[in-house]
């Protein structure tokens, strides 16, 4: 339904508080380097303008699209050329090209300082002095560092952030109350950002059809009692929501997400028995709860899939008449029966089924041709099962840190051209699959592990896309969304790689390592490990383990020494020499 003024429509639907928050997120995700104060000023100007449109929808410029209004506002930033370079050229374009241009310049790895957490008392004072500014600053800092963060979900995080400070700044032990909550929000936020980044990559790089297929599989697992038509409706609506958010249309996205939550709760009887608690919550919590809701129980006595998808004489007729609908039904039926499969596995099975029908429905004997299609699924199912089994055994044997190190070595050997910080970040995240998923029973391991790995490998893909250095990474990232993980798994040592020149500076450490947190110290050691492998890609596990053990002992020894800096200098030289000898550098 058309509105005279889109901006007035969204302001009224969302309310002033959410409107302002979403506009701030949108602006911070586009202009990631702009100071906080500049964004607040722009947001206030947009908000005042929106209020004039609410008062009179026929007022000047109120009929303009949100992209036009927001783009015009962003293009008033005086330092656009100096700060953003060629991004300023976007302002010479007309909509919709201008917005597309802004989207293309979103930076997944912006050159921004690490967020350092102030002392608890300092934070509590800031919170009490100006709660509104404090919370806006949170939105701004997260949004600019995570330009694809799911905006309505960020509102939910901000609400929890506020609740944490409200509660803990009154507590007897503020730090004990607040710090675990902030750690949890940070970790959940990173995970949420990465999950959304995959959704946006899916839409932007592989198209709406790919996203819809993912959504059919996931929603069918989650709502196995819902009819196909119901799942299809939810998929269509969910696709619209994520298309909008990934496209920077955050007001529309948040509004449509609220509508979708409302629809789901009004129709929960025909969707899932698990929604009751979610639907009693306020809007932001409700939407989050629905997105995370556990899978409903599978209906009893579901018939064999073979009847409709292999044995029926109408398979090719049904496929030819409406290919995507028929494949959607196949995916729905398979997924609702298999909560124990990863979504990407289900999509591989659907792709195999589609390829088989494309071939066999043009064959002289179609039924004979596709009769054994389900047999082709067996190796596809067994491959991730075996991989997860092997890696969970390795994780249980090594523990998280050493499991991460094993993956660091594995991935550095596969794609040694990738930057060391990226290899460390990605391998550390890959390694977290162990503690995240291996504790689950068999029936939950694969969906946990492989779908998590898809999220992490997408981080590698988006970081690599910014500065491509490896054809192998590009190939695995672009050829097939659902085969990314098998593609990376199949990579062997890159025999074409010319080892990096040895640089002693890379392996020089100082006393500051002693004051780092355990996590930061691990990252330092893992950075050294990657560099070692880049220097000596043919080094054996045993050689690398020996060097890393010596390195750990060296750090421990020097951190206990009275004159730490002298210890690091003298013992460090010895360690480098010994390591070179051990590795034959």
């Amino acid at each position: 339904d058309a509105h005279k003024s889109e901006v007035a429509h969204r302001f009224k639907d969302l309310g002033e508080e959410n409107f302002k928050a979403l506009v701030l997120i949108a602006f911070a995700q586009y202009l990631q380097q702009c100071p906080f104060e500049d964004h607040v000023k722009l947001v206030n100007e947009v908000t005042e303008f929106a209020k004039t449109c609410v008062a009179d929808e026929s007022a000047e410029n109120c009929d303009k699209s949100l992209h036009t209004l927001f783009g015009d506002k962003l293009c008033t930033v005086a330092t656009l050329r100096e700060t953003y370079g060629e991004m300023a050229d976007c302002c010479a374009k007309q909509e919709p090209e201008r917005n597309e241009c802004f989207l293309q310049h979103k930076d997944d790895n912006p050159n921004l300082p690490r967020l350092v957490r102030p002392e608890v008392d300092v934070m509590c004072t800031a919170f009490h002095d100006n709660e509104e500014t404090f919370l806006k600053k949170y939105l701004y800092e997260i949004a600019r560092r995570h330009p694809y963060f799911y905006a309505p979900e960020l509102l939910f995080f901000a609400k929890r952030y506020k609740a944490a400070f409200t509660e803990c700044c009154q507590a007897a032990d503020k730090a004990a109350c607040l710090l675990p909550k902030l750690d949890e929000l940070r970790d959940e936020g990173k995970a949420s950002s990465a999950k959304q980044r995959l959704k946006c990559a899916s839409l932007q790089k592989f198209g709406e059809r790919a996203f819809k297929a993912w959504a059919v599989a996931r929603l069918s697992q989650r709502f196995p009692k819902a009819e196909f038509a119901e799942v299809s409706k939810l998929v269509t609506d969910l696709t619209k929501v994520h298309t909008e958010c990934c496209h920077g249309d955050l007001l529309e996205c948040a509004d449509d997400r609220a509508d979708l939550a409302k629809y789901i709760c009004e129709n929960q009887d025909s969707i899932s028995s698990k929604l009751k608690e979610c639907c009693e919550k306020p809007l932001l919590e409700k939407s989050h709860c629905i997105a995370e809701v556990e899978n409903d129980e599978m209906p009893a006595d579901l018939p064999s899939l073979a009847a409709d998808f292999v044995e029926s004489k109408d398979v090719c007729k049904n496929y030819a008449e409406a290919k995507d609908v028929f494949l959607g039904m196949f995916l729905y039926e398979y997924a609702r029966r298999h909560p124990d499969y990863s979504v990407v596995l289900l999509l591989r099975l659907a792709k195999t089924y589609e390829t088989t029908l494309e071939k066999c429905c043009a064959a002289a004997d179609p039924h004979e041709c596709y009769a054994k299609v389900f047999d082709e699924f067996k190796p596809l199912v067994e491959e991730p099962q075996n991989l997860i089994k092997q890696n969970c055994e390795l994780f249980e044997q090594l523990g998280e840190y050493k499991f991460q190190n094993a993956l660091l070595v594995r991935y550095t050997k596969k794609v040694p051209q990738v930057s060391t910080p990226t290899l460390v970040e990605v391998s550390r995240n890959l390694g977290k699959v162990g503690s995240k998923c291996c504790k689950h029973p068999e029936a939950k391991r694969m969906p946990c592990a492989e779908d998590y790995l898809s999220v992490v490998l997408n981080q590698l893909c988006v970081l690599h896309e910014k500065t491509p250095v490896s054809d192998r990474v590009t190939k695995c990232c672009t050829e097939s969304l659902v085969n990314r993980r098998p593609c990376f798994s199949a990579l062997e040592v890159d025999e074409t790689y010319v080892p990096k020149e040895f640089n002693a500076e890379t392996f020089t450490f100082h006393a500051d390592i002693c004051t780092l947190s355990e996590k930061e110290r691990q990252i330092k050691k893992q950075t050294a490990l990657v560099e070692l492998v880049k220097h000596k890609p043919k080094a054996t596990k045993e050689q690398l383990k020996a060097v890393m053990d010596d390195f750990a002992a060296f750090v421990e020894k020097c951190c206990k020494a009275d004159d730490k800096e002298t210890c690091f200098a003298e013992e460090g030289k010895k360690l480098v020499a010994a390591s070179q000898a051990a590795l034959g550098l």
Epitope: C316, A320, E358, K359, D365
Partner: antibody
Framework: QVQLQQSGAELVRPGSSVKISCKAS????????MNWVKQRPGQGLEWIGQ????????YYNGRFKGKATLTADKSPTTAYMQLSSLTSEDSAVYVC???????????WGQGTTLTVSS | QIVLTQSPAIMSASPGEKVTMTCSAS?????MHWYQQKSGTSPKRWIY???KLASGVPVRFSGSGSGTSYSLTIRSMEAEDAATYYC?????????FGAGTKLEIK
């Protein structure tokens, strides 16, 4: 655009063999069945068989088993039909045709005339 | 194998006249396709999946049928329609063609 270019006319002795080619261009050769059809002068069309270049799968009309052998090569995107133990009955125009979903033939080659004569 | 019988074998029609030719199958088939062939050239797909017109085929042509009985109709005959028309079944191996209906212009 899709094109199927067949090899030239052949004049061969009875008892010998011949290999006819069909060079495909303008589409994903591996993903479509290539069919072969026989047409004798003044006669109707007779389906010989088909090959799927993606994996080499074949279907034959029982009447041509042992007579025709279908092969395909993905790198020059070419399908071949070898006819063996030739007799005058094999004199005909042979046409390759691309098969699509639900079994129709949407593109046809120009035909190769085979004459078997002593 | 399924035998397709086309009738009539030969027919002629005046310009503007409605033309109907049939293809009868010895047992039920899933889909029927029709091809047009003019002398000295390869056949061209004309009607496929029983009733769909191939690219470039004039809308005066139509196809219909199910089971064992299929037909091709020309609403209003034109000189360029003079050719031999073959039906072909899909759904049973081997694929088979009818013997053809030769359509001439009066």
């Amino acid at each position: 655009q899709v094109q199927l270019q067949q090899s030239g006319a052949e004049l061969v002795r009875p008892g010998s063999s011949v290999k006819i080619s069909c060079k495909a261009s303008g589409y994903a050769f591996s993903n479509y069945w290539m069919n072969w059809v026989k047409q004798r002068p003044g006669q109707g069309l007779e389906w010989i068989g088909q090959i799927y270049p993606g994996d080499g799968d074949t279907y034959y009309n029982g009447r041509f088993k042992g007579k025709a052998t279908l092969t395909a090569d993905k790198s020059p995107t070419t399908a071949y039909m070898q006819l063996s133990s030739l007799t005058s009955e094999d004199s005909a125009v042979y046409v390759c045709a691309r098969g699509v979903i639900l079994g129709s033939f949407d593109y046809w080659g120009q035909g190769t005339t085979l004459t078997v004569s002593s | 194998q399924i035998v397709l019988t086309q009738s009539p074998a030969i027919m002629s029609a005046s310009p503007g006249e409605k033309v109907t030719m049939t293809c009868s199958a010895s047992s039920s088939v899933s889909y029927m396709h029709w091809y047009q062939q003019k002398s000295g050239t390869s056949p061209k797909r004309w009607i496929y999946d029983t009733s769909k017109l191939a690219s470039g085929v004039p809308v005066r042509f139509s196809g219909s049928g199910s089971g064992t009985s299929y037909s091709l109709t020309i609403r209003s005959m034109e000189a360029e329609d003079a050719a031999t028309y073959y039906c072909q079944q899909w759904g049973s191996n081997p694929l088979t063609f009818g013997a053809g209906t030769k359509l001439e212009i009066k």
